[in-house]
Interface confidence: low
């Protein structure tokens, strides 16, 4: 039975040209995290594998940095980066947990960096 829950940074906004940290946190389970996939709609951004470490998709290598933790940092944001992002936790023995983040990249300086939780 899957007892875990994923907390995410929820709906966030950032300024064009800036950077943003996407974070998810899996709680309420003792399952072992074997891999975390970060995806944008149907595109793979990055993988953090417990044994192999990070792999960043070639299309994003210039703009994506691993971390902090299992999170992902997006840099040099463009308006085209607006959309849904998913953190997909592969765990044993529970299976797969998915969290959703919506990022809006704004042209002006009115972006508010909202976050539902902080990871120190």
């Amino acid at each position: 039975m899957m007892t875990g829950t994923i907390e995410t940074t929820g709906n966030i906004s950032a300024e064009k040209g800036g950077s943003i940290i996407l974070q998810c946190h899996l709680s309420s389970t003792t399952a072992q995290v074997t891999q975390v996939n970060w995806e944008q709609q149907d595109q793979l951004l990055a993988i953090c594998n417990a044994d192999l470490g990070w792999h960043i998709s070639p299309s994003f290598k210039d703009r994506v940095a691993p971390g902090p933790g299992l999170g992902l940092t997006l840099q040099s944001l463009t308006v085209n980066d607006t959309g849904e992002y998913f953190c997909i936790y592969h765990t044993y023995p529970d299976g797969t947990y998915t969290g959703r983040i919506f990022l809006e990249v704004l042209e002006s300086s009115v972006a508010e960096h909202g976050a539902r939780f902080q990871i120190p």
Epitope: W54, H55, P58, K61, P66, G67
Partner: antibody, heavy 116, light 107 residues
């Protein structure tokens, strides 16, 4: 000017270890991955692994997982690679290079000779 | 691991000619291919990234094309200084791998 500086040569005995350096200058060390590449005399290039100075994350080519250890000294903007249990097969030029996926800056290489 | 096969192994041409090197991947890798030049006793130098993207400071006679499994590096009007080994390298999946290289000799 962006540079990666490596010592020219290391002579080591079979069974010993060697630790070579790669000193970065001209850019922010913690924002670019450092890769290590092996080239045996007259042969092609082999990727050993990479390390991200911003977080110390490493990735290894499975072939070198028990041979190479990648470390950092961020205070001096220097990356290190230690090779253990050396044999004649480890005699090669070892390059460090900068980048994730593509390698835009290369050191001059360290020639490691394993000989008794 | 992804295998990259380069051809020809050796190419001998006269200055001013156009040359092409081939790199074939063992599986589809999109455009995740780089090309490097390595002169005798020198370090590799990045020529092309992601299949066809040019690199600052590299002469415009160097160009790359291809996607999927088949890639080409072309040199339009070869110069004597282009005498070197040329390697392709994939960044689609760890471990990154290089092709076996192609040697360009200038007559």
């Amino acid at each position: 000017q962006v540079q990666l500086q490596q010592p020219g040569a290391e002579l080591v005995k079979p069974g010993a270890s060697v630790k070579m350096s790669c000193k970065a200058s001209g850019y922010t060390f913690t924002t670019f991955w450092i890769n290590w590449v092996k080239q045996r005399p007259g042969q092609g290039l082999e990727w050993i692994g990479d390390i991200f100075p911003g977080r110390g994350i490493t990735n290894y080519n499975g072939k070198f997982k028990n041979k190479a250890t990648l470390t950092l000294d961020t205070s001096s903007s220097t990356a290190y690679m230690q090779l253990s249990s050396l044999t004649s097969e480890d005699s090669a030029v070892y390059y460090c290079s900068r980048g994730l996926g593509y390698f835009d800056v290369w050191g001059a290489g360290t020639t490691v000779t394993v000989s008794s | 691991d992804i295998l990259l096969t380069q051809s020809p192994a050796i190419l001998s041409v006269s200055p001013g000619e156009r040359v092409s090197f081939s790199c074939r991947a063992s599986q589809s890798i999109g455009t995740s291919i780089q090309w490097y030049q390595q002169r005798t006793n020198g370090s590799p130098r990045l020529l092309i990234k992601y299949g066809s993207e040019s690199i600052s400071g590299i002469p415009s006679r160097f160009s790359g094309s291809g996607s999927g499994t088949d890639f080409t590096l072309s040199i339009n009007s070869v110069e004597s200084e282009d005498s070197a080994d040329y390697y392709c390298q994939q960044s689609y999946r760890w471990p990154y791998t290089f092709g076996g290289g192609s040697k360009l000799e200038i007559k």
